[in-house]
């Protein structure tokens, strides 16, 4: 969490941002809140990006003002116009690109004063893994697949029964470049699996950590997966 304060002139206002990560090709949110104002027409929101001389987005007098927007953000940005009055200056960024990563500034002007706060935005690709029993294999084998990751992640297997065991000798991980030539499909195979055990396939890069669990018993197979972003710090 980053909390910024205005300086000089009018009173300062508190602006708060939260560091976040964007999944390339999908839509992302750059979070920013501020002390609200009574009149929408008195609120100016400017989003800026370090190293980019045009604006990322501007909202003033109750509407978007895009004459100074940089080309790299053309047609890809929007604020939540109906929530500006309650102090939400968050920016929706469509079709996140790898090059969108960087330091952003949320700059606010209201009748109460000015304020700004920075946020770090990371970009990459991350997806939920799915673990299945590979019935085609000669021995009991698990196959963990996740369709989109970038940068290249690490893959680690773990088991509930053999806690702390190193499965690197009995697993094989491959990375297959997807058609857009950036993200990769992750496939990891674990051999010599024993029944009545829960196995976890953990995929991690500097942006996200995802885990796919599978519990194999004689009577059923249970699966569970979750994904966690690693860099959500507020400012």
């Amino acid at each position: 969490l980053i909390i910024g304060f205005g300086i000089s002139g009018r009173h300062s206002i508190t602006v708060t941002t939260v560091a976040s990560a964007g999944n390339i090709g999908e839509d992302g949110i750059l979070s920013c809140t501020f002390e609200p104002d009574i009149k929408l027409s008195d609120i100016v929101i400017q989003w800026l990006k370090e190293g980019v001389l045009g604006l990322v987005h501007e909202f003033k007098e109750g509407k978007d003002e895009l004459s100074e927007q940089d080309e790299m953000f053309r047609g890809r940005t929007a604020v939540f116009a109906d929530q500006v009055i309650v102090g939400n200056a968050s920016l929706r960024l469509k079709n996140v690109q790898l090059t969108d990563a960087g330091t952003y500034k949320c700059y606010i002007i209201t009748s109460k004063g000015k304020g700004n706060a920075n946020l770090e935005y990371k970009t990459g690709a991350f997806s939920m893994p799915e673990v299945n029993v590979d019935y085609n294999a000669s021995s009991e084998t698990l196959r963990c697949e996740a369709p989109r990751w970038f940068p290249q992640p690490t893959v680690v297997w773990a088991s509930q029964v053999d806690q702390g065991a190193n499965f690197s000798e009995v697993s094989n991980t491959s990375f297959e470049l997807n058609s857009e030539n950036v993200t990769m499909k992750v496939v990891s195979v674990l051999y010599n699996v024993t029944i009545n055990n829960t196995y976890s396939c953990m995929i991690e890069n500097d942006i996200a950590k995802a885990t796919g669990d599978i519990k194999v018993t004689e009577s059923e197979i249970k699966r569970r997966s979750h994904l966690q972003l690693l860099n959500s710090k507020a400012s």
């Epitope: 190293g51 001389l53 045009g54 895009l66 004459s67 100074e68 927007q69 940089d70 080309e71 053309r74 047609g75």
Partner: antibody, heavy 116, light 107 residues
Framework: EVQLQQSGPELVKPGASVKMSCKAS????????MNWVRQSHGKSLEWIGR????????NYNQKFKGKATLTVDKSLSTAYMQLSSLTSEDSAVYYC?????????WGQGTTLTVSS | DIQMTQTTSSLSASLGDRVTISCRAS??????LNWYQQKPDGTIKLLIY???RLHSGVPSRFSGSGSGSDYSLTISNLEQEDIATYFC?????????FGGGTKLEFK
């Protein structure tokens, strides 16, 4: 008052290179992109590319990649364009112009003549 | 690249006339259309940016309009000093592209 002062006319031989300059004054040099635009005799304007003076980043028109190289010297508030492997086709007036989306201030132009 | 077309390459008018110069883009340019004036000595000045916004110091007889891919520059009450060539330019996407220019002359 914003001013962009360009270097003087150049007469060079085919195959040579040339480096022209654009000195900015009246504003913070690193706050605005510097664009370069070509106008061949009696013709329209062609955007060559732009440089970000804050970090030296460049964007080029595909047509001029390998022909033009854009640089800056922040300490002198000056942008430069080097043109290489010159031919008579490169004879033109070259302008520097400030900003993104539109060019709000222009230099007076540098006339380049390529002739043997 | 986006193609910019100014169909009229030259235009004759009289002092006090109202003159309209048009410009068409090969695709929607979302109002990122700008107009420049080039005097016979080669000096170039911005007149209008973002379709209709008057650049500082430009006389109010200049105005711009349009949307999508069709735009125009209007000079009302033409003056002697308006003799020049006028170029449109799109700033929606890189590379910037310019129209071929419209040369304004007096009858």
């Amino acid at each position: 008052e914003v001013q962009l002062q360009q270097s003087g006319p150049e007469l060079v031989k085919p195959g040579a290179s040339v480096k022209m300059s654009c000195k900015a004054s009246g504003y913070t040099f690193t706050d605005y992109y510097m664009n370069w635009v070509r106008q061949s005799h009696g013709k329209s304007l062609e955007w060559i590319g732009r440089v970000n003076p804050s970090n030296g980043g460049t964007n080029y028109n595909q047509k001029f990649k390998g022909k033009a190289t854009l640089t800056v010297d922040k300490s002198l508030s000056t942008a430069y364009m080097q043109l290489s492997s010159l031919t008579s086709e490169d004879s033109a007036v070259y302008y520097c112009a400030r900003r993104h989306n539109y060019a709000d201030f222009w230099g007076q132009g540098t006339t380049l003549t390529v002739s043997s | 690249d986006i193609q910019m077309t100014q169909t009229t390459s030259s235009l004759s008018a009289s002092l006090g006339d109202r003159v309209t110069i048009s410009c068409r883009a090969s695709q929607d340019i979302s109002n990122y259309l700008n107009w420049y004036q080039q005097k016979p000595d080669g000096t170039i000045k911005l007149l209008i940016y973002y379709t209709s916004r008057l650049h500082s110091g430009v006389p109010s007889r200049f105005s711009g309009s349009g949307s999508g891919s069709d735009y125009s520059l209007t000079i009302s009450n033409l003056e002697q000093e308006d003799i020049a060539t006028y170029f449109c330019q799109q700033g929606n996407t890189l590379p910037w592209t310019f129209g071929g220019g419209t040369k304004l002359e007096f009858k």
